[in-house]
């Protein structure tokens, strides 16, 4: 059977050209966005940055797996990036976009 | 056909007896923990409380679904509960446990 790895951060480089955003984003050309994936299975160890609720949900899932899902693997720390882009009036704008880069993942 | 509902909060009452915790937790007997479940599919509307990263990840998933998963539905707001319990020395303790109740969910 497929045994997914435990919840963790995976590397992902996102190219703005691939997203079709190259006409309005001047710089950067892309960025290391990363993503979270993996199992949040019992027992939730310290690496999994689990909330108290996630711990409770995991125990309830084990008792009642048909109705209550496992917690999911989601970002716990996100960073911003600065983007240079054209606005609707073709002005060049430098803006900081929050919550763009995954720095850490956990079970939520 | 499989049409999973969009990411949202679901009601869940957790009984401490069901968890086998009745011998050390005096009160409450249980609590409304709730949980998050549902799809984080394109387009991520305002109800889904999506982060910028989740929006980017959704677009990357559409391009490359085998490699990058959809964002997951996780708590965005959590509340504490107060618990009266026996410690290891049989002292009665009142403690506030953080992040025990899901108040809102979103795509992360």
């Amino acid at each position: 059977s497929e045994l997914k790895t435990a919840c963790k951060k995976h590397e992902l480089y996102v190219s703005f050209q691939d997203l079709g955003w190259q006409d309005w984003i001047i710089a950067p050309k892309g960025y290391a966005a990363n993503y979270c994936d993996g199992e949040c299975s019992f027992p939730l160890n310290a690496h999994m940055n689990a909330t108290n609720h996630a711990i409770v949900q995991t125990l309830v899932h084990l008792m009642n797996p048909e109705y209550v899902p496992k917690p999911c693997c989601a970002p716990t720390k996100l960073n911003a990036i600065s983007v240079l882009y054209f606005d609707d009036n073709s002005n060049v704008i430098l803006k900081k976009y929050r919550n763009m880069v995954v720095r850490a993942c956990g079970c939520h | 056909s499989e049409l999973k509902t969009a990411c949202k909060k679901h009601e869940l009452y957790v009984s401490f007896q069901d968890l086998g915790w009745q011998d050390w937790i005096i009160a409450p007997k249980g609590y409304a923990a709730n949980y998050c479940d549902g799809e984080c599919s394109f387009p991520l509307n305002a109800h889904m409380n999506a982060t910028n990263h989740a929006i980017v990840q959704t677009l990357v998933h559409l391009m490359n679904p085998e490699y990058v998963p959809k964002p997951c539905c996780a708590p965005t707001k959590l509340n504490a509960i107060s618990v009266l319990y026996f410690d290891d020395n049989s002292n009665v303790i009142l403690k506030k446990y953080r992040n025990m109740v899901v108040r809102a969910c979103g795509c992360h």
Epitope: S1, E2, L3, K4, E39, S41, F42, P43, L59, L62, M63, N64, P65, E66, Y67, K70 | S1, E2, L3, K4, T5, H10, D18, D37, G38, E39
Partner: antibody, heavy 121, light 112 residues
């Protein structure tokens, strides 16, 4: 009282198709996860697959032995569960049961009486 | 080959105690999932006997009890009666995709 009644079984040739139904009554069918379980003559119970409730988006899952050949669906307005069986093989010969999953501990608390499917040339 | 392993048969005299084991692995019982037990009398559909590893549905006599430890579970029947002669199945979940798994079944024979 809770009742599950299967129908649609019978004799079918290898490669053929059959659709089983499971009529539910005595409970709010739409709120429950329901499964198909089969039992070959003189053998043990074998899980076939399940469909979740409306809250969980009717998501389905199947045993490896039937994946791609069998399809589970449900019509909550008719309180009925279905099992569409295609490309049937002789090893699919069995009594097919539908079973309801109780909501607190996920046990199969109610079963139908079963319907016999015989795949033979 | 079933995912959960049960002895094919057990037997006991009326009034005796018998136990039926159910051995799994780290991806099912060992992952923490509950175990349920079903009784199947000859020619009938299975019936839920023990749920949540150790709880009895209403109407099930307290002669039946269940327990779970590590990667195994067991069903105990005390004060064996002739009407207990049946097939018994354990059931749990596989953690990778939360799919149902059954034991191969155990035939209980009440002697004499």
């Amino acid at each position: 009282q809770v009742q599950l009644v299967e129908s649609g079984g019978g004799l079918v040739k290898p490669g053929g198709s059959l659709r089983l139904s499971c009529a539910a009554s005595g409970f709010t069918f739409s709120s429950y996860v329901v499964h198909w379980v089969r039992q070959a003559p003189g053998k043990g119970l074998e899980w076939v697959g399940r469909i979740k409730d409306h809250k969980q988006g009717y998501t389905t899952a199947y045993a490896a032995s039937v994946k791609g050949r069998f399809t589970i669906s449900r019509d909550d307005s008719k309180n009925t569960l279905y099992l569409q069986m295609n490309s049937l093989k002789t090893e699919d010969t069995a009594v097919y049961y539908c079973a309801r999953v109780e909501r607190s501990k996920s046990g199969f608390d109610n079963w139908g009486q079963g319907t016999l499917v015989t795949v033979s040339s | 080959q079933s995912v959960l392993t049960q002895p094919p048969s057990v037997s006991g005299a009326p009034g005796q105690r018998v136990t039926i084991s159910c051995t799994g692995s780290s991806s099912n019982i060992g992952a923490g999932y509950s175990v349920h037990w079903y009784q199947q009398l000859p020619g009938t559909a299975p019936k839920l006997l023990i749920y949540g590893s150790s709880e009895r549905p209403s109407g099930v006599p307290d002669r039946f009890s269940g327990s779970k430890s590590g990667t195994s579970a067991s069903l105990a029947i005390t004060g064996l009666q002739a009407e207990d002669e049946a097939d018994y199945y354990c059931q749990s979940w596989d953690s990778s995709q939360t799919l149902v798994v059954f034991g191969g079944g155990t035939k209980l024979t009440v002697l004499g």
